[in-house]
């Protein structure tokens, strides 16, 4: 259902700078369905429309992400934009999917790797060990070298995450696996949160 993601992005890109700022502030206080996590304030406030769309989809999946975006837009008085999203929602059948999903069954949605992107960039220090675990199976030689060429751990992790959008679930699970081996306490800490 990539249409929902595109619709969210279109709506957010139609907001002015001040409106986007207001959208983020409302997102911090909007009533969430039981079991859903809130996007951390620090990360949220720095995001552009593309990053915010990705974060909405990784945290809430497309169906609920779309619904949440509509709620916030309506709350801001942007009825027209919200109605455009409503149309997308009805066309894609997201309304049926969202209504039939109990909150607990989708709580904490989004893959661990996507959900904790910022924290992993900030807190993974043994990047070379992670790279070695992914070399060949997930990362090509060129990608491996490109990440290693970066100087700081944070830059290496940023570079590594630049490849993630093209990964399938198996690749993301491989990264998660490497992190569990090399940074077990970090993974436990993030999973707990």
């Amino acid at each position: 259902m990539g249409r929902a993601r595109d619709a969210i992005l279109d709506a957010l890109e139609n907001l002015s700078g001040d409106e986007l700022k207001k959208f983020k502030m409302k997102l911090l206080t909007v009533q969430l369905r039981e079991g859903y996590g809130r996007i951390p304030r620090g990360a949220l406030l720095q995001m552009d429309a593309i990053d915010l769309t990705d974060k909405l989809v990784s945290y809430y999946l497309e169906s609920y992400g779309l619904e949440l975006t509509m709620t916030v837009l309506r709350d801001m008085g942007l009825q027209e934009l919200a109605e455009q999203l409503q149309t997308t929602k009805e066309e894609s059948g997201a309304v049926a999917a969202a209504a039939s999903v109990p909150a607990q069954s989708t709580a904490r949605t989004g893959h661990f790797v996507d959900q904790h992107r910022q924290a992993l960039i900030a807190r993974v220090t043994e990047v070379d060990g992670v790279l070695d675990a992914l070399h060949g199976s997930v990362l090509t030689e060129g990608q491996y070298q490109a990440v290693r060429a970066e100087t700081t751990s944070q830059d290496k992790m940023r570079k590594l995450f630049s490849f993630v959008p093209s990964w399938n679930l198996t690749c993301k699970d491989s990264l998660l696996q490497a992190l569990k081996e090399i940074h077990p306490y970090l993974v436990m800490d993030l999973e707990q949160s």
């Epitope: 069954s105 661990f112 399938n168 436990m188």
Partner: antibody, heavy 122, light 107 residues
């Protein structure tokens, strides 16, 4: 609510093959992985592998590579497991299961199909 | 592959007793250990996840503890409906593996 409905019991001759289905409802099929487990009488559970209908990616237990093939049909929200070259060792109850959360580091199963009994006998 | 050794393989106890089942991993699995209950002819049911977290709707007489390679499932004040086989499962790495099971019977 979340439900995983498996196909009925199968009786297959040695050397034959079988396709077991797991139809899901109550959530968006492409949002979660489906895992498959094998349980022989009076024995424990074995993890066969998983499929993520969102992108079609699969992961297999080395022990079941060549024996099991996992597929998913988005249009019918159904996951399938095809077992080939069947022997009496393949006689078991097969379960499909869904982790409670997608992409969690924990890999724990909160939702299970009712099980499909496979009997391989001539 | 990570081997999960469960003991005892069978256990007989009286109603009201407190019983303990142990699970030993062949390597460090941190807290990535889950417990399931399977009643005869039924499906496995999640009891405990991440070593010590009680799953939704599971009675508080069930508890889990441990980390690293040693884990325990404790059932206090044993009830008739607790007759079942209990399995541990590691979620540290693929392939996911289960213990051999502990069959609990009432004396």
């Amino acid at each position: 609510q979340v439900q995983l409905q498996q196909s009925d019991a199968e009786l297959v001759k040695p050397g034959g093959s079988v396709k077991i289905s797991c139809k899901v409802s109550g959530y968006t099929f492409t949002d979660h992985t489906i895992h498959w487990m094998k349980q022989r009488p009076e024995q424990g559970l074995e993890w066969i592998g998983n499929i993520y209908p969102g992108d079609g990616s699969t992961m297999y237990n080395e022990k079941f590579k060549g024996k099991a093939t996992l597929t998913a049909d988005k249009s019918s929200s159904t996951a399938y497991m095809h077992l080939n070259s069947l022997t009496s060792e393949d006689s078991a109850v097969y379960f499909c299961a869904r982790p409670y959360y997608f992409g969690s580091a924990s890999y724990y199963f909160g939702y299970w199909g009712q099980g499909t009994t496979l009997t391989v006998s001539s | 592959d990570i081997q999960m050794n469960q003991s005892p393989s069978s256990l007989s106890a009286s109603l009201g007793d407190t019983i303990t089942i142990t699970c030993h991993a062949s390597q460090n699995i941190n807290v990535w250990l889950n417990w399931y209950q399977q009643k005869p002819g039924n499906i496995p049911k999640l009891l405990i996840y991440k070593a010590s977290n009680l799953h939704t709707g599971v009675p508080s007489r069930f508890s889990g503890s441990g980390s690293g390679i040693g884990f325990t499932l404790t059932i206090s004040s044993l009830q008739p409906e607790d007759i079942a086989t209990y399995y541990c499962q590691q979620g540290q790495s693929y392939p996911l593996t289960f213990g051999g099971g502990t069959k609990l019977e009432i004396k």
